[in-house]
C-alpha cells in the first residue's frame, strides 16, 4: 500500500474531487442555453421547466401561458409550433428519428380560440415534415414523400404531389445525401414571406445505388435497411424545384423553376433557396465538380404566371484554389431593396468576408476585411448588419458578434460582445427578433455558458435568460482540468491547439498525451467553448494531457490553410497532427512512450492514418466509425474535396489514401477499431475493410462493434463505448484501474 500525502491542506479544498467517468456518462455537468422562440419584434415563446408554453412580452414585462402542460401531456407532446395568426398550435408527439435531421411524428392541431383540438380532417400519421405558412394558418406537410396543403387546419388537404415513393421520389423532404451533405435540414420546402407561394424540391433517386445493411432487432431474421446512397463517383439524385400558388393551387399547378444553362450542362446540385419577396426567389446551384456555384434570382411574371430567371440575375461564384465556399456555399442575406444582398465569400487575399452585391459579383463591395474571417450574417436591417467573426485578439477559435451601421457613410463597426464578459465569454451566437428589435446572446464559453437578452438599438443587456447557476454550484467542488489555447508556428503554417491539463499539472513532470482529432475539411476543434466531457475526465482523474490541433484543411483561418487539402485528403491533416506531437514532446512534460491518438468519423480516419504513419510516435490509438476509403463515402461530401474517383481525375489519390493500404504499419501500435453496424453515414463497410486488411496482413488489433447502432453510438452504447475506450487507454498508458 502506498500512502500518498494529501495534495491540499485547507479544509475547503479537501472537499474537491476529480471528475469521474460516471459524471460524464450521467451528464451531471451539462449546461443549458436559452433560445427565445421569437414570434414578433418584442415577443417570444418559451417552454417553462414545468412544460407550459409561455408567451413573454419584453416591452410590457408581462407573460402568460398560451398552452398548459396539461394540454401538452394529453397528447404526449414533445414539441409545438404556434401559427403566425396565433389561432392554432401544432403539437408534436411520437417522435421517431430517421437520419441526422429527419424524423417522423404525429401532429395534433389545437385551436386556441375554443381550447379544443381540431376535429375532422385530422392529419395522417406519421408525418415527415409539417410547417405553418409565415402569415395566417395555412399548413404544408409531407406524408409518404408527398406534399399536402391545408388552407386552414380543419380543411381537407390539397395534394400537391403524387409521385412520392419511398426511396425513389422525395417531395418536400431531402433524400439521404441532400439531408446530410447539402441542405443540412429535414425539409426541402419553403414558404414565400407572406405565404402566397410554396417552393419545393423533388429528388429523384431512382437510379442511385443502394447501400444495404442488416438491422438485427429482436426477430428471428434481421431486417435489411436499404438507402439510396451515392458514393463517390456514383449516380447522383436528380433534383427539380417547383413553386405552387397556394391560394389557388388547383388552377396553375406547380411551376418548374429553370436551372441556369451553365449549370444544367452537366451533373449539378441544388444548394439552397431563399425567398426575397412573395414574387422574387433566389436559388443557388452548384456543379457536381463543386468549384462553380451560381446564384439565380427569379421573378414571378403575373401576366405569364411563370417564374423568370434572367441571365442578368445570375451571379457566379468560382474557386480557383479549392471548392466553392467553406463547408457549404454561403447563402445570401437580401437588403430592403429586395435585389441587392450581402454574402460571405473569399476576398482577393483568400479570407472569407462579407461582400455587398448590387449588380454583379465582380463589382461587389467588400464590407469586412482582414486576416480573419466573417463567419455568419445574422440579420440585416435598414441601418445595421449583424455578423459574427473571429477577428477579436486574433484567436480563430473565438466568435464575437459585430454590428456594422450600413445606414451611415462610411459604415462604422462595433463589437457588441467583445467586452461583455471577457473572461467568461469568447464564443457567442445570437438570435434576433423581427427587425432586430431585440436579440438574445448565447455565450458558449470558455466559462460557464450564459444566455442574455439585449435591446437591438442600444445593445443594452435587459436580462439574463439562463446563467446555469446550478451547474456553477455543482462545479465548485470539482477539480476541473486547466485549458489553454495557443499556437505553434511551423514552416509558415500556424497550428492552433487546445491543451487540457490535469488540475495539479506540473511542468517538471511527465504526462501521458492523448491527441483528440477530427481534422475534416472546414472543421474547427480548437474553440473557446465550455465542456465537461470525456477528455475533461481523462485529464482530471486519470492525469492525462489531452491536445486538440487544428491543422491544414481546417476552417476560419483563410483559404491557404483551408484549401491545402484539396484533392489530397489524408496527407496534411495527418502530417500536422504528427508535427504538433513532436512540438509537444519538445515542451518537456510529455512522456513520449505514452502517446495515443483517437478520433471519430473523419477523426477516426486521421487517427488511423496517424497510427499507421510509421513514425513510432504513437503507442496506441482508437478509431471510432472511421472512413477507410473515400470511395466508400458520400459523393457530395467526398467529391467536394477529392474530385472524382476516375482515371482522368483523381483515382490515384483515392487509392493511395486508404487506411487499408497501410495495414502493415499497424503492426507496432495497439489499435482499437469501433463501429456501429447500422451506421447509415460512414458505413460499417469501412471498418469491415480495415479489419479484413489487418487480418490479411496478420496484424493483431482490437475491435468492438455496436449492433444496430448508427454513427452516433447513442444510448447505452455511449456508456459502453467510453468505458471500453477508457480501459483501453489506461491499459496503454499503464494506469492502474
Amino acid at each position: 500500500i502506498v500512502l500518498r500525502p494529501s495534495r491540499v491542506h485547507n479544509s475547503e479544498e479537501n472537499t474537491m474531487r476529480a471528475l469521474t467517468l460516471k459524471d460524464i456518462l450521467n451528464g451531471t455537468f451539462s449546461y443549458k442555453t436559452f433560445f427565445p422562440n421569437w414570434i414578433s419584434g418584442q415577443e417570444y415563446l418559451h417552454q417553462s421547466a414545468d412544460n407550459n408554453i409561455v408567451l413573454y412580452n419584453i416591452e410590457t414585462g408581462q407573460s402568460y401561458t398560451i398552452l398548459s402542460n396539461r394540454t401538452m401531456k394529453s397528447v404526449n407532446a414533445s414539441n409545438y409550433g404556434l401559427s403566425p395568426d396565433r389561432q392554432f398550435v401544432y403539437l408534436e408527439s411520437d417522435y421517431s428519428k430517421l437520419w441526422r435531421y429527419s424524423y417522423t411524428a404525429t401532429y395534433y392541431i389545437y385551436d386556441l380560440s375554443n381550447g379544443e383540438f381540431v376535429r375532422g380532417n385530422e392529419l395522417p400519421r406519421p408525418i415527415q415534415y409539417l410547417c405553418w405558412s409565415p402569415v395566417g394558418s395555412k399548413l404544408a406537410y409531407v406524408y409518404q414523400n408527398n406534399i399536402y396543403l391545408k388552407q386552414r387546419p380543419g380543411d381537407p388537404p390539397f395534394q400537391i404531389t403524387f409521385n412520392g415513393r419511398e426511396n425513389k421520389i422525395f417531395n418536400g423532404i431531402p433524400d439521404w445525401v441532400y439531408e446530410e451533405e447539402m441542405l443540412a435540414t429535414k425539409y426541402a420546402l419553403w414558404w414565400s414571406p407572406n405565404g402566397k407561394f410554396l417552393a419545393y424540391a423533388e429528388f429523384n433517386d431512382t437510379d442511385i445505388p443502394v447501400i444495404a445493411y442488416s438491422y438485427y432487432g429482436d426477430e428471428q431474421y434481421p431486417r435489411t435497411i436499404n438507402i439510396p446512397y451515392p458514393k463517390a463517383g456514383a449516380k447522383n439524385p436528380v433534383v427539380r424545384i417547383f413553386i405552387i400558388d397556394t391560394t389557388y393551387p388547383a388552377y396553375v399547378g406547380p411551376q418548374e423553376v429553370p436551372v441556369p444553362a451553365m449549370i444544367a450542362s452537366s451533373d449539378y446540385y441544388f444548394s439552397w433557396l431563399t425567398w426575397v419577396t412573395d414574387e422574387r426567389v433566389c436559388l443557388q446551384w452548384l456543379k457536381r465538380v463543386q468549384n462553380v456555384s451560381v446564384l439565380s434570382i427569379c421573378d414571378f411574371r403575373e401576366d405569364w404566371q411563370t417564374w423568370d430567371c434572367p441571365k442578368t440575375q445570375e451571379h457566379i461564384e468560382e474557386s480557383r484554389t479549392g471548392w466553392a465556399g467553406g463547408f457549404f456555399v454561403s447563402t445570401p442575406v437580401f437588403s430592403y431593396d429586395a435585389i441587392s444582398y450581402y454574402k460571405i465569400f473569399s476576398d482577393k487575399d483568400g479570407y472569407k468576408h462579407i461582400h455587398y452585391i448590387k449588380d454583379t459579383v465582380e463589382n461587389a463591395i467588400q464590407i469586412t476585411s482582414g486576416k480573419w474571417e466573417a463567419i455568419n450574417i445574422f440579420r440585416v436591417t435598414q441601418d445595421s448588419l449583424f455578423y459574427s467573426s473571429n477577428e477579436f485578439e486574433e484567436y480563430p477559435g473565438r466568435r464575437n458578434i459585430y454590428r456594422i451601421s450600413i445606414g451611415s457613410y462610411p459604415p462604422s463597426k462595433k463589437c457588441v460582445t467583445c467586452h461583455l464578459r471577457k473572461e467568461r465569454c469568447q464564443y457567442y451566437t445570437a438570435s434576433f427578433s423581427d427587425y432586430a428589435k431585440y436579440y438574445a446572446l448565447v455565450c458558449y464559453g470558455p466559462g460557464i455558458p450564459i444566455s442574455t437578452l439585449h435591446d437591438g438599438r442600444t445593445d443594452q443587456e435587459i436580462k439574463i435568460l439562463e446563467e446555469n447557476k446550478e451547474l456553477e454550484n455543482a462545479l465548485k467542488n470539482i477539480q476541473l482540468p486547466k485549458e489553454e489555447i495557443k499556437k505553434l508556428e511551423v514552416d509558415e503554417i500556424t497550428l492552433w491547439y487546445k491543451m487540457i491539463l490535469p488540475p495539479q499539472f506540473d511542468r517538471s513532470k511527465k504526462y501521458p498525451l492523448l491527441i483528440q482529432v477530427y481534422g475534416g475539411p472546414c472543421s474547427q476543434s480548437v474553440r473557446s467553448v465550455f465542456a465537461v466531457n470525456w477528455i475533461s475526465y481523462l485529464a482530471s482523474k486519470e492525469g492525462m494531457v489531452i491536445a486538440l490541433v487544428d491543422g491544414r484543411g481546417t476552417a476560419f483561418q483563410g483559404d491557404k490553410l483551408l484549401y491545402a487539402v484539396y484533392r489530397k485528403l489524408g496527407v496534411y491533416e495527418v502530417e500536422d497532427q504528427i508535427t504538433a506531437v513532436r512540438k509537444f514532446i519538445e515542451m518537456g512534460f510529455i512522456d513520449e512512450k505514452r502517446i495515443a491518438i483517437w478520433g471519430w468519423s473523419y477523426g477516426g480516419y486521421v487517427s488511423s492514418l496517424a497510427l499507421a504513419s510509421g513514425t513510432g510516435l504513437f503507442k496506441c490509438g482508437i478509431a471510432v466509425a472511421p472512413v477507410s476509403s473515400w470511395e466508400y463515402y458520400a459523393s457530395v461530401y467526398t467529391e467536394r474535396f477529392m474530385g472524382l474517383p476516375t482515371k482522368d481525375d483523381n483515382l490515384e489519390h483515392y487509392k493511395n489514401s486508404t487506411v487499408m493500404a497501410r495495414a502493415e504499419y499497424f503492426r507496432n501500435v495497439d489499435y482499437l477499431l469501433i463501429h456501429g453496424t447500422a451506421d447509415d453515414n460512414v458505413h460499417f463497410q469501412n471498418s469491415a475493410q480495415i479489419a479484413k486488411a489487418l487480418v490479411n496482413a496478420q496484424v493483431d488489433f482490437q475491435a468492438m462493434w455496436y449492433s444496430d447502432q448508427n454513427h452516433g453510438l447513442s444510448g447505452l452504447s455511449t456508456n459502453h463505448l467510453y468505458t471500453h475506450m477508457t480501459h483501453f487507454l489506461k491499459q496503454c498508458f499503464s494506469l492502474s484501474d
Partner: antibody, heavy 117, light 108 residues
C-alpha cells in the same frame, strides 16, 4: 384572345391508336398547366389527364393510365394526347382545357373520337 | 375519388326566376377547390365560378357560388334566356378531378 383548337379525332377500331393535338394561342403556353377532359355522347364530363407548364409532371385518370400519354411541345404551343389500346368506352368528345385540377377557364371546341369496329 | 352529386337533375324555371343548384361532395372539399361550369348543346363547357367562389372573367354578377365543406350552391339570381343550359360542379382538391353529373336548367 385565348384560343384552343383540337384536332386528330376520328373513327378508330378497338385496340387502335390515335393522337390528338391541341394548338394554343393568345397566352404564354409554356407557363400553364393543361388538361384533357372528355364527354361521352349524352353523358357528363370526365377529366382524363393533366400536364404542368414545363411538361415535367403528368397525371392520368385510372381509366386511361398506361394507355394514354399526355405531352406538350412548348416551342410549338401544342398539347398532345397519344391514345393507344382504344376501347369502345373511350368514345367521346375530347376537349383540351387550360388548367391543372380545376378552374378550367378556357376550353377548345372539342374533337370527336369514335371507337367502333 | 370524390363523388359529386348534383341536384336536382333537372330544374324547370321561367326567365326572371331564381335558380338554386346544389352540389354535394362525398368528402370535404372547401370552396377553394370547387368550380362551376355552364354547357350549352354542341358547345364546350364555360367556366362560371372559379375555385375560391370567384366569378370567372366576363361572367355576369347574377351568378354566384357559395358553400363549404361538402355542400355547395350555384345561384342564378334572375334567369335570362341565355342561362338555360346544363351546369356542372367540379372539385380540384383531389386527384382525379371530378365533375358532378350535371343539372339541366330548362325553360318551364
Amino acid at each position: 384572345e385565348v384560343q384552343l383548337l383540337e384536332s386528330g379525332g376520328g373513327l378508330v377500331q378497338p385496340g387502335g391508336s390515335l393522337r390528338l393535338s391541341c394548338a394554343a394561342s393568345g397566352f404564354t403556353f409554356s407557363s400553364y398547366a393543361m388538361s384533357w377532359v372528355r364527354q361521352a355522347p349524352g353523358k357528363g364530363l370526365e377529366w382524363v389527364s393533366g400536364i404542368i407548364g414545363s411538361g415535367g409532371i403528368t397525371y392520368y385518370a385510372d381509366s386511361v393510365k398506361g394507355d394514354f400519354t399526355i405531352s406538350r411541345d412548348n416551342s410549338g404551343n401544342t398539347l398532345y394526347l397519344q391514345m393507344n389500346s382504344l376501347r369502345a368506352e373511350d368514345t367521346a368528345v375530347y376537349y383540351c382545357a387550360k388548367g391543372w385540377f380545376g378552374g378550367f377557364n378556357y376550353w377548345g371546341q372539342g374533337t370527336l373520337v369514335t371507337v367502333s369496329s | 375519388e370524390i363523388v359529386l352529386t348534383q341536384s336536382p337533375g333537372t330544374l324547370s324555371l321561367s326567365p326572371g326566376e331564381r335558380a338554386t343548384l346544389s352540389c354535394r361532395a362525398s368528402q370535404s372539399v372547401t370552396s377553394s377547390y370547387l368550380a362551376w361550369y355552364q354547357q350549352k348543346p354542341g358547345q364546350a363547357p364555360r367556366l362560371l365560378i372559379n375555385v375560391g367562389s370567384r366569378r370567372a372573367t366576363g361572367i355576369p354578377d347574377r351568378f354566384s357560388g357559395s358553400g363549404s365543406g361538402t355542400d355547395f350552391t350555384l345561384t342564378i339570381s334572375r334567369l335570362e334566356p341565355e342561362d338555360f343550359a346544363v351546369y356542372y360542379c367540379q372539385q380540384g382538391i383531389m386527384l382525379p378531378p371530378t365533375f358532378g353529373q350535371g343539372t339541366k336548367v330548362e325553360i318551364k
